[in-house]
Amino acid sequence: MAVTACQGLGFVVSLIGIAGIIAATCMDQWSTQDLYNNPVTAVFNYQGLWRSCVRESSGFTECRGYFTLLGLPAMLQAVRALMIVGIVLGAIGLLVSIFALKCIRIGSMEDSAKANMTLTSGIMFIVSGLCAIAGVSVFANMLVTNFWMSTANMYTGMGGMVQTVQTRYTFGAALFVGWVAGGLTLIGGVMMCIACRGLAPEETNYKAVSYHASGHSVAYKPGGFKASTGFGSNTKNKKIYDGGARTEDEVQSYPSKHDYV
Protein backbone atom coordinates (compact mmCIF):
# COMPACT_ATOMS: atom_id res chain seq x y z
CA MET A 1 0.00 0.00 0.00
CA ALA A 2 2.81 2.37 0.95
CA VAL A 3 4.59 1.51 -2.31
CA THR A 4 1.47 2.42 -4.29
CA ALA A 5 1.17 5.67 -2.34
CA CYS A 6 4.82 6.53 -2.94
CA GLN A 7 4.52 5.75 -6.63
CA GLY A 8 1.26 7.65 -6.98
CA LEU A 9 2.59 10.66 -5.09
CA GLY A 10 5.80 10.57 -7.16
CA PHE A 11 3.71 10.56 -10.32
CA VAL A 12 1.52 13.49 -9.18
CA VAL A 13 4.51 15.55 -7.99
CA SER A 14 6.31 14.91 -11.29
CA LEU A 15 3.17 15.77 -13.25
CA ILE A 16 2.92 19.13 -11.43
CA GLY A 17 6.66 19.67 -11.96
CA ILE A 18 6.54 18.98 -15.69
CA ALA A 19 3.48 21.20 -16.09
CA GLY A 20 5.53 23.89 -14.33
CA ILE A 21 8.52 23.32 -16.63
CA ILE A 22 6.25 23.68 -19.68
CA ALA A 23 4.69 26.82 -18.19
CA ALA A 24 8.10 28.33 -17.41
CA THR A 25 9.38 27.56 -20.91
CA CYS A 26 6.38 29.32 -22.47
CA MET A 27 6.38 32.31 -20.10
CA ASP A 28 7.56 35.71 -21.33
CA GLN A 29 8.92 36.88 -17.99
CA TRP A 30 12.31 35.17 -17.83
CA SER A 31 13.97 38.53 -17.40
CA THR A 32 12.22 41.72 -16.38
CA GLN A 33 13.37 45.32 -16.42
CA ASP A 34 15.06 46.26 -13.16
CA LEU A 35 12.88 48.81 -11.41
CA TYR A 36 15.22 49.58 -8.50
CA ASN A 37 15.87 53.19 -9.52
CA ASN A 38 12.42 53.81 -11.01
CA PRO A 39 9.71 51.70 -9.36
CA VAL A 40 6.96 53.26 -11.49
CA THR A 41 7.99 53.32 -15.11
CA ALA A 42 6.06 54.43 -18.19
CA VAL A 43 7.58 51.65 -20.33
CA PHE A 44 8.28 48.20 -18.88
CA ASN A 45 10.38 45.62 -20.74
CA TYR A 46 10.47 41.90 -20.18
CA GLN A 47 11.86 38.97 -22.13
CA GLY A 48 11.26 35.26 -22.54
CA LEU A 49 12.99 32.44 -24.37
CA TRP A 50 10.91 32.99 -27.49
CA ARG A 51 9.98 36.68 -27.58
CA SER A 52 10.50 40.03 -25.91
CA CYS A 53 7.67 42.26 -24.73
CA VAL A 54 7.08 45.89 -23.88
CA ARG A 55 4.23 46.94 -21.64
CA GLU A 56 3.33 50.61 -21.75
CA SER A 57 1.66 52.63 -19.02
CA SER A 58 -1.26 52.97 -21.42
CA GLY A 59 -1.92 49.27 -20.85
CA PHE A 60 -0.84 48.22 -24.34
CA THR A 61 1.57 45.31 -24.55
CA GLU A 62 3.59 44.56 -27.65
CA CYS A 63 5.51 41.31 -28.04
CA ARG A 64 7.97 40.45 -30.78
CA GLY A 65 9.25 36.95 -31.48
CA TYR A 66 12.93 36.19 -32.00
CA PHE A 67 12.62 35.37 -35.68
CA THR A 68 16.27 34.45 -36.04
CA LEU A 69 18.11 31.34 -34.96
CA LEU A 70 21.66 32.19 -35.88
CA GLY A 71 21.52 35.70 -34.46
CA LEU A 72 20.58 34.58 -30.94
CA PRO A 73 23.14 34.19 -28.14
CA ALA A 74 24.50 30.67 -27.75
CA MET A 75 23.53 30.67 -24.08
CA LEU A 76 19.89 31.38 -24.94
CA GLN A 77 19.94 28.52 -27.43
CA ALA A 78 21.44 26.26 -24.76
CA VAL A 79 18.73 27.22 -22.27
CA ARG A 80 16.04 26.55 -24.89
CA ALA A 81 17.58 23.16 -25.60
CA LEU A 82 17.81 22.22 -21.92
CA MET A 83 14.18 23.18 -21.29
CA ILE A 84 12.94 21.29 -24.36
CA VAL A 85 14.97 18.19 -23.44
CA GLY A 86 13.52 18.46 -19.93
CA ILE A 87 9.97 18.65 -21.29
CA VAL A 88 10.46 15.77 -23.74
CA LEU A 89 12.06 13.50 -21.12
CA GLY A 90 9.38 14.46 -18.62
CA ALA A 91 6.58 13.75 -21.09
CA ILE A 92 8.04 10.34 -21.95
CA GLY A 93 8.54 9.69 -18.25
CA LEU A 94 4.89 10.51 -17.58
CA LEU A 95 3.77 8.20 -20.35
CA VAL A 96 5.92 5.34 -19.03
CA SER A 97 4.90 5.96 -15.42
CA ILE A 98 1.18 5.80 -16.27
CA PHE A 99 1.63 2.20 -17.40
CA ALA A 100 3.90 1.52 -14.44
CA LEU A 101 1.37 2.63 -11.81
CA LYS A 102 0.52 -0.26 -9.47
CA CYS A 103 -3.11 0.85 -9.26
CA ILE A 104 -3.56 0.47 -13.03
CA ARG A 105 -3.94 -3.04 -14.42
CA ILE A 106 -2.78 -3.55 -18.02
CA GLY A 107 -3.22 -7.11 -19.24
CA SER A 108 -1.00 -9.50 -17.33
CA MET A 109 1.93 -7.14 -16.83
CA GLU A 110 4.42 -8.59 -14.36
CA ASP A 111 5.42 -6.70 -11.23
CA SER A 112 9.03 -6.84 -12.36
CA ALA A 113 8.09 -5.05 -15.59
CA LYS A 114 6.22 -2.42 -13.59
CA ALA A 115 9.24 -2.01 -11.32
CA ASN A 116 11.53 -1.51 -14.31
CA MET A 117 9.15 1.00 -15.86
CA THR A 118 8.85 2.86 -12.55
CA LEU A 119 12.63 3.05 -12.30
CA THR A 120 12.91 4.20 -15.93
CA SER A 121 10.31 6.94 -15.44
CA GLY A 122 11.95 7.94 -12.16
CA ILE A 123 15.32 8.37 -13.85
CA MET A 124 13.65 10.32 -16.66
CA PHE A 125 11.99 12.63 -14.14
CA ILE A 126 15.28 13.18 -12.34
CA VAL A 127 17.09 14.04 -15.58
CA SER A 128 14.13 16.21 -16.67
CA GLY A 129 14.21 18.12 -13.39
CA LEU A 130 17.97 18.55 -13.61
CA CYS A 131 17.67 19.86 -17.18
CA ALA A 132 15.11 22.44 -16.08
CA ILE A 133 17.14 23.52 -13.05
CA ALA A 134 20.28 23.71 -15.20
CA GLY A 135 18.49 25.71 -17.91
CA VAL A 136 17.05 28.21 -15.47
CA SER A 137 20.36 28.49 -13.59
CA VAL A 138 22.31 29.14 -16.80
CA PHE A 139 19.84 31.89 -17.71
CA ALA A 140 20.02 33.35 -14.20
CA ASN A 141 23.82 33.37 -14.36
CA MET A 142 23.64 35.11 -17.74
CA LEU A 143 21.33 37.74 -16.22
CA VAL A 144 23.60 38.35 -13.24
CA THR A 145 26.62 38.78 -15.50
CA ASN A 146 24.77 41.19 -17.81
CA PHE A 147 23.29 43.05 -14.84
CA TRP A 148 26.67 43.90 -13.38
CA MET A 149 28.10 44.70 -16.80
CA SER A 150 25.26 47.14 -17.49
CA THR A 151 25.57 48.58 -13.98
CA ALA A 152 29.20 49.38 -14.69
CA ASN A 153 28.12 51.20 -17.86
CA MET A 154 24.82 52.44 -16.42
CA TYR A 155 25.29 55.97 -17.67
CA THR A 156 27.10 56.39 -20.94
CA GLY A 157 27.68 60.00 -21.89
CA MET A 158 26.80 61.09 -25.39
CA GLY A 159 29.21 63.82 -26.32
CA GLY A 160 29.45 64.63 -22.64
CA MET A 161 26.12 66.41 -22.92
CA VAL A 162 23.26 63.99 -22.50
CA GLN A 163 22.77 60.80 -20.52
CA THR A 164 21.22 57.64 -21.84
CA VAL A 165 20.07 55.13 -19.25
CA GLN A 166 20.85 51.55 -20.18
CA THR A 167 18.02 49.11 -19.40
CA ARG A 168 19.02 46.53 -16.81
CA TYR A 169 17.23 43.19 -16.46
CA THR A 170 16.66 41.12 -13.35
CA PHE A 171 15.09 37.74 -12.53
CA GLY A 172 11.59 37.26 -13.91
CA ALA A 173 8.78 35.10 -12.53
CA ALA A 174 9.58 32.29 -14.99
CA LEU A 175 12.93 31.63 -13.31
CA PHE A 176 11.26 30.94 -9.98
CA VAL A 177 8.58 28.83 -11.64
CA GLY A 178 11.33 26.89 -13.43
CA TRP A 179 13.39 26.28 -10.29
CA VAL A 180 10.35 25.12 -8.30
CA ALA A 181 9.06 22.97 -11.16
CA GLY A 182 12.48 21.41 -11.73
CA GLY A 183 12.75 20.67 -8.02
CA LEU A 184 9.31 19.05 -7.93
CA THR A 185 10.11 16.90 -10.98
CA LEU A 186 13.35 15.86 -9.34
CA ILE A 187 11.58 14.96 -6.07
CA GLY A 188 8.92 13.07 -8.01
CA GLY A 189 11.63 11.13 -9.83
CA VAL A 190 13.38 10.20 -6.59
CA MET A 191 10.04 9.01 -5.17
CA MET A 192 9.47 6.86 -8.25
CA CYS A 193 12.92 5.32 -7.84
CA ILE A 194 12.21 4.60 -4.18
CA ALA A 195 8.85 3.07 -5.11
CA CYS A 196 10.60 0.85 -7.65
CA ARG A 197 12.46 -0.95 -4.89
CA GLY A 198 9.19 -1.88 -3.20
CA LEU A 199 7.60 -2.98 -6.45
CA ALA A 200 10.09 -5.74 -7.30
CA PRO A 201 8.40 -9.12 -6.69
CA GLU A 202 9.15 -10.98 -3.42
CA GLU A 203 11.03 -14.25 -3.94
CA THR A 204 8.55 -16.33 -1.92
CA ASN A 205 9.24 -19.62 -3.73
CA TYR A 206 12.15 -20.31 -1.33
CA LYS A 207 11.56 -21.46 2.24
CA ALA A 208 13.42 -19.91 5.10
CA VAL A 209 16.31 -22.13 6.12
CA SER A 210 17.54 -22.27 9.73
CA TYR A 211 21.22 -22.59 10.40
CA HIS A 212 22.07 -23.64 13.94
CA ALA A 213 25.29 -22.33 15.36
CA SER A 214 26.59 -23.15 18.86
CA GLY A 215 24.53 -21.26 21.44
CA HIS A 216 22.82 -19.08 18.86
CA SER A 217 19.95 -19.52 16.48
CA VAL A 218 19.99 -17.10 13.58
CA ALA A 219 17.41 -17.26 10.78
CA TYR A 220 18.24 -15.93 7.33
CA LYS A 221 15.30 -15.24 5.08
CA PRO A 222 15.73 -14.58 1.36
CA GLY A 223 14.30 -11.22 0.54
CA GLY A 224 14.91 -10.18 4.12
CA PHE A 225 16.69 -7.01 2.98
CA LYS A 226 13.53 -5.93 1.25
CA ALA A 227 11.54 -6.66 4.33
CA SER A 228 13.87 -4.54 6.45
CA THR A 229 13.61 -1.62 4.07
CA GLY A 230 9.88 -1.96 3.46
CA PHE A 231 7.63 1.06 3.64
CA GLY A 232 5.11 -0.20 6.16
CA SER A 233 6.63 0.58 9.54
CA ASN A 234 10.19 1.69 8.87
CA THR A 235 10.50 5.06 10.58
CA LYS A 236 13.54 6.06 8.59
CA ASN A 237 11.60 5.79 5.35
CA LYS A 238 8.66 7.56 6.97
CA LYS A 239 10.97 10.49 7.64
CA ILE A 240 11.88 10.51 3.97
CA TYR A 241 8.17 10.77 3.16
CA ASP A 242 7.56 13.59 5.60
CA GLY A 243 10.62 15.40 4.34
CA GLY A 244 9.40 15.00 0.80
CA ALA A 245 5.99 16.39 1.61
CA ARG A 246 7.47 19.25 3.57
CA THR A 247 9.85 20.11 0.76
CA GLU A 248 6.92 20.17 -1.65
CA ASP A 249 5.06 22.62 0.57
CA GLU A 250 8.10 24.82 0.99
CA VAL A 251 8.74 24.84 -2.72
CA GLN A 252 5.16 25.70 -3.60
CA SER A 253 5.05 28.61 -1.20
CA TYR A 254 8.33 30.03 -2.47
CA PRO A 255 7.80 33.73 -3.14
CA SER A 256 7.78 34.41 -6.85
CA LYS A 257 8.66 37.88 -8.12
CA HIS A 258 6.01 39.82 -9.96
CA ASP A 259 6.68 43.30 -11.33
CA TYR A 260 3.77 45.56 -11.76
CA VAL A 261 3.87 48.90 -13.48
Partner: antibody
Protein backbone atom coordinates in the same frame (compact mmCIF):
# COMPACT_ATOMS: atom_id res chain seq x y z
CA UNK B 1 -17.48 58.41 -30.59
CA UNK B 2 -15.04 58.90 -27.73
CA UNK B 3 -15.99 61.78 -25.45
CA UNK B 4 -14.49 63.12 -22.23
CA UNK B 5 -16.79 65.61 -20.55
CA UNK B 6 -15.42 67.61 -17.63
CA UNK B 7 -17.23 69.47 -14.84
CA UNK B 8 -17.67 73.24 -14.88
CA UNK B 9 -15.36 76.07 -13.83
CA UNK B 10 -14.50 76.50 -10.15
CA UNK B 11 -13.43 79.47 -8.03
CA UNK B 12 -11.67 78.58 -4.79
CA UNK B 13 -9.92 80.30 -1.92
CA UNK B 14 -6.28 79.54 -1.03
CA UNK B 15 -5.98 76.48 1.23
CA UNK B 16 -9.23 74.97 -0.02
CA UNK B 17 -9.64 71.83 -2.18
CA UNK B 18 -11.16 71.35 -5.59
CA UNK B 19 -12.57 68.17 -7.14
CA UNK B 20 -12.89 68.05 -10.92
CA UNK B 21 -14.74 65.23 -12.68
CA UNK B 22 -14.26 63.71 -16.12
CA UNK B 23 -16.98 61.48 -17.54
CA UNK B 24 -15.90 59.08 -20.28
CA UNK B 25 -18.14 57.63 -22.98
CA UNK B 26 -17.88 55.96 -26.39
CA UNK B 27 -15.23 53.38 -25.45
CA UNK B 28 -14.38 50.67 -22.89
CA UNK B 29 -13.72 52.79 -19.80
CA UNK B 30 -11.52 50.23 -18.00
CA UNK B 31 -9.37 49.62 -21.08
CA UNK B 32 -7.50 52.92 -21.07
CA UNK B 33 -5.60 54.86 -18.41
CA UNK B 34 -6.79 58.39 -17.68
CA UNK B 35 -4.31 61.23 -17.21
CA UNK B 36 -4.61 64.74 -15.85
CA UNK B 37 -2.70 67.65 -17.34
CA UNK B 38 -2.89 71.30 -16.34
CA UNK B 39 -2.06 74.51 -18.15
CA UNK B 40 -1.54 77.79 -16.30
CA UNK B 41 -2.62 80.96 -18.19
CA UNK B 42 -0.21 81.63 -21.06
CA UNK B 43 2.00 78.72 -19.93
CA UNK B 44 2.87 75.24 -21.15
CA UNK B 45 1.44 71.86 -20.26
CA UNK B 46 2.18 70.04 -16.99
CA UNK B 47 1.41 66.37 -16.32
CA UNK B 48 -0.16 65.73 -12.90
CA UNK B 49 -0.78 62.01 -12.75
CA UNK B 50 -2.73 59.07 -14.11
CA UNK B 51 -5.03 56.30 -12.98
CA UNK B 52 -5.70 52.81 -14.32
CA UNK B 53 -9.50 52.40 -14.20
CA UNK B 54 -9.20 48.59 -14.29
CA UNK B 55 -6.94 48.06 -11.28
CA UNK B 56 -7.24 51.51 -9.71
CA UNK B 57 -3.46 51.96 -9.69
CA UNK B 58 -2.13 55.51 -9.77
CA UNK B 59 1.05 57.40 -10.69
CA UNK B 60 1.61 61.00 -9.61
CA UNK B 61 3.96 63.81 -10.43
CA UNK B 62 6.05 64.23 -7.28
CA UNK B 63 5.94 68.00 -7.80
CA UNK B 64 2.48 67.98 -6.25
CA UNK B 65 3.77 66.27 -3.07
CA UNK B 66 0.63 64.34 -2.24
CA UNK B 67 -1.75 67.20 -2.96
CA UNK B 68 -3.30 65.35 -5.90
CA UNK B 69 -5.65 62.39 -5.49
CA UNK B 70 -7.12 60.52 -8.45
CA UNK B 71 -10.17 58.30 -7.99
CA UNK B 72 -12.64 56.50 -10.22
CA UNK B 73 -16.28 55.52 -10.23
CA UNK B 74 -16.63 52.56 -12.59
CA UNK B 75 -20.43 52.60 -12.39
CA UNK B 76 -20.58 56.04 -14.01
CA UNK B 77 -17.30 55.79 -16.00
CA UNK B 78 -16.05 58.90 -14.23
CA UNK B 79 -12.58 59.88 -13.10
CA UNK B 80 -12.07 62.47 -10.35
CA UNK B 81 -9.07 64.68 -9.67
CA UNK B 82 -8.85 66.34 -6.28
CA UNK B 83 -6.24 69.00 -5.60
CA UNK B 84 -5.88 70.11 -2.00
CA UNK B 85 -4.12 73.02 -0.23
CA UNK B 86 -4.76 75.28 -3.20
CA UNK B 87 -2.52 78.29 -3.83
CA UNK B 88 -2.72 81.08 -6.39
CA UNK B 89 -0.24 79.34 -8.71
CA UNK B 90 -2.73 76.44 -9.04
CA UNK B 91 -4.94 78.73 -11.15
CA UNK B 92 -5.05 76.86 -14.46
CA UNK B 93 -7.11 74.91 -16.95
CA UNK B 94 -7.23 71.25 -15.91
CA UNK B 95 -7.60 68.61 -18.61
CA UNK B 96 -8.31 64.90 -18.43
CA UNK B 97 -6.83 62.89 -21.29
CA UNK B 98 -7.06 59.25 -22.35
CA UNK B 99 -3.79 57.36 -22.73
CA UNK B 100 -3.14 55.63 -26.04
CA UNK B 101 -0.32 53.74 -27.81
CA UNK B 102 3.11 55.10 -27.01
CA UNK B 103 1.67 56.57 -23.78
CA UNK B 104 0.35 59.45 -25.90
CA UNK B 105 -2.88 61.25 -25.04
CA UNK B 106 -5.29 60.76 -27.93
CA UNK B 107 -8.52 62.23 -26.53
CA UNK B 108 -8.80 65.22 -24.22
CA UNK B 109 -11.60 66.72 -22.15
CA UNK B 110 -12.70 70.27 -22.92
CA UNK B 111 -10.87 71.54 -19.83
CA UNK B 112 -11.98 72.89 -16.46
CA UNK B 113 -10.86 76.34 -15.36
CA UNK B 114 -9.92 76.49 -11.68
CA UNK B 115 -9.30 79.95 -10.27
CA UNK B 116 -7.66 80.30 -6.87
CA UNK B 117 -8.17 83.76 -5.47
CA UNK B 118 -8.60 85.29 -2.04
CA UNK C 1 13.12 64.22 -14.45
CA UNK C 2 13.63 64.34 -18.21
CA UNK C 3 13.85 67.93 -19.44
CA UNK C 4 12.35 68.65 -22.86
CA UNK C 5 13.76 71.68 -24.71
CA UNK C 6 11.97 72.99 -27.79
CA UNK C 7 13.37 75.39 -30.37
CA UNK C 8 12.58 77.90 -31.66
CA UNK C 9 10.08 79.48 -29.24
CA UNK C 10 8.19 80.93 -32.18
CA UNK C 11 8.31 80.48 -35.92
CA UNK C 12 6.88 82.54 -38.79
CA UNK C 13 6.53 80.70 -42.09
CA UNK C 14 4.86 81.64 -45.38
CA UNK C 15 1.84 79.64 -46.53
CA UNK C 16 2.90 76.55 -48.47
CA UNK C 17 6.43 76.68 -47.01
CA UNK C 18 8.10 74.12 -44.78
CA UNK C 19 8.07 74.58 -40.99
CA UNK C 20 10.52 72.69 -38.80
CA UNK C 21 10.32 72.43 -35.00
CA UNK C 22 13.07 70.82 -32.91
CA UNK C 23 12.82 69.04 -29.59
CA UNK C 24 15.73 67.86 -27.46
CA UNK C 25 15.49 65.61 -24.39
CA UNK C 26 17.97 65.41 -21.52
CA UNK C 27 17.88 61.59 -21.69
CA UNK C 28 17.35 59.14 -24.50
CA UNK C 29 13.71 58.31 -25.19
CA UNK C 30 14.64 55.22 -27.18
CA UNK C 31 13.38 52.03 -25.54
CA UNK C 32 15.73 49.11 -26.11
CA UNK C 33 12.89 46.58 -25.79
CA UNK C 34 11.08 47.57 -28.97
CA UNK C 35 13.46 50.15 -30.46
CA UNK C 36 10.76 52.80 -30.35
CA UNK C 37 11.21 56.41 -29.31
CA UNK C 38 8.66 57.49 -26.74
CA UNK C 39 8.15 61.01 -27.96
CA UNK C 40 4.80 62.59 -28.85
CA UNK C 41 3.86 65.77 -30.70
CA UNK C 42 0.71 67.80 -29.97
CA UNK C 43 -0.96 70.77 -31.65
CA UNK C 44 -2.89 73.27 -29.52
CA UNK C 45 -5.04 76.04 -30.92
CA UNK C 46 -6.21 78.96 -28.73
CA UNK C 47 -9.03 78.03 -26.35
CA UNK C 48 -8.86 74.34 -27.28
CA UNK C 49 -7.31 71.27 -25.66
CA UNK C 50 -4.15 69.84 -27.30
CA UNK C 51 -4.60 67.47 -30.24
CA UNK C 52 -2.43 64.39 -30.78
CA UNK C 53 -0.47 64.52 -34.03
CA UNK C 54 2.39 62.03 -33.78
CA UNK C 55 3.40 59.31 -31.30
CA UNK C 56 6.43 57.00 -31.15
CA UNK C 57 8.33 59.97 -32.66
CA UNK C 58 7.20 59.23 -36.21
CA UNK C 59 3.82 57.45 -36.19
CA UNK C 60 1.02 59.72 -37.38
CA UNK C 61 -2.32 59.35 -35.62
CA UNK C 62 -5.09 58.36 -38.03
CA UNK C 63 -6.85 61.39 -39.44
CA UNK C 64 -3.80 63.65 -39.17
CA UNK C 65 -2.83 65.16 -42.55
CA UNK C 66 0.31 63.67 -44.10
CA UNK C 67 1.97 67.08 -44.30
CA UNK C 68 2.83 66.48 -40.62
CA UNK C 69 5.78 64.19 -40.10
CA UNK C 70 8.02 63.33 -37.19
CA UNK C 71 11.62 62.15 -37.19
CA UNK C 72 14.60 61.69 -34.92
CA UNK C 73 15.84 59.17 -32.39
CA UNK C 74 17.39 59.07 -28.95
CA UNK C 75 17.50 62.67 -27.78
CA UNK C 76 16.94 64.79 -30.91
CA UNK C 77 13.56 65.00 -32.61
CA UNK C 78 11.92 67.07 -35.32
CA UNK C 79 8.36 67.86 -36.31
CA UNK C 80 8.02 68.97 -39.92
CA UNK C 81 5.03 70.60 -41.59
CA UNK C 82 5.88 70.15 -45.26
CA UNK C 83 3.48 72.77 -46.60
CA UNK C 84 2.06 75.15 -44.02
CA UNK C 85 -1.69 75.79 -44.18
CA UNK C 86 -3.67 78.57 -42.47
CA UNK C 87 -5.27 76.03 -40.09
CA UNK C 88 -1.81 74.94 -38.87
CA UNK C 89 -1.35 78.18 -36.92
CA UNK C 90 -1.04 76.88 -33.34
CA UNK C 91 1.37 76.07 -30.52
CA UNK C 92 3.17 72.74 -30.90
CA UNK C 93 4.38 70.70 -27.91
CA UNK C 94 6.66 67.69 -27.68
CA UNK C 95 6.27 65.26 -24.77
CA UNK C 96 8.44 62.63 -23.08
CA UNK C 97 6.35 59.49 -22.76
CA UNK C 98 9.25 57.26 -21.73
CA UNK C 99 9.82 58.04 -18.08
CA UNK C 100 7.74 59.37 -15.20
CA UNK C 101 6.99 62.14 -14.63
CA UNK C 102 5.82 62.63 -18.21
CA UNK C 103 7.18 66.02 -19.26
CA UNK C 104 6.35 68.52 -22.01
CA UNK C 105 8.50 70.93 -23.98
CA UNK C 106 7.87 74.65 -23.55
CA UNK C 107 6.03 74.85 -26.87
CA UNK C 108 6.70 76.44 -30.26
CA UNK C 109 4.28 79.00 -31.65
CA UNK C 110 3.82 78.72 -35.43
CA UNK C 111 2.52 81.80 -37.25
CA UNK C 112 2.08 82.82 -40.86
CA UNK C 113 4.65 85.22 -42.26
Amino acid sequence: QVQLVQSGAEVKKPGASVKVSCKASGYSFTGYNMNWVRQAPGQGLEWMGNIDPYYGGTSYNQKFKGRVTLTIDKSTSTVYMELSSLRSEDTAVYYCARMYHGNAFDYWGQGTTVTVSS
Amino acid sequence: DIVMTQSPDSLAVSLGERATINCKSSQSLLNSGNLKNYLTWYQQKPGQPPKLLIYWASTRKSGVPDRFSGSGSGTDFTLTISSLQAEDVAVYYCQNDYSYPLTFGGGTKVEIK
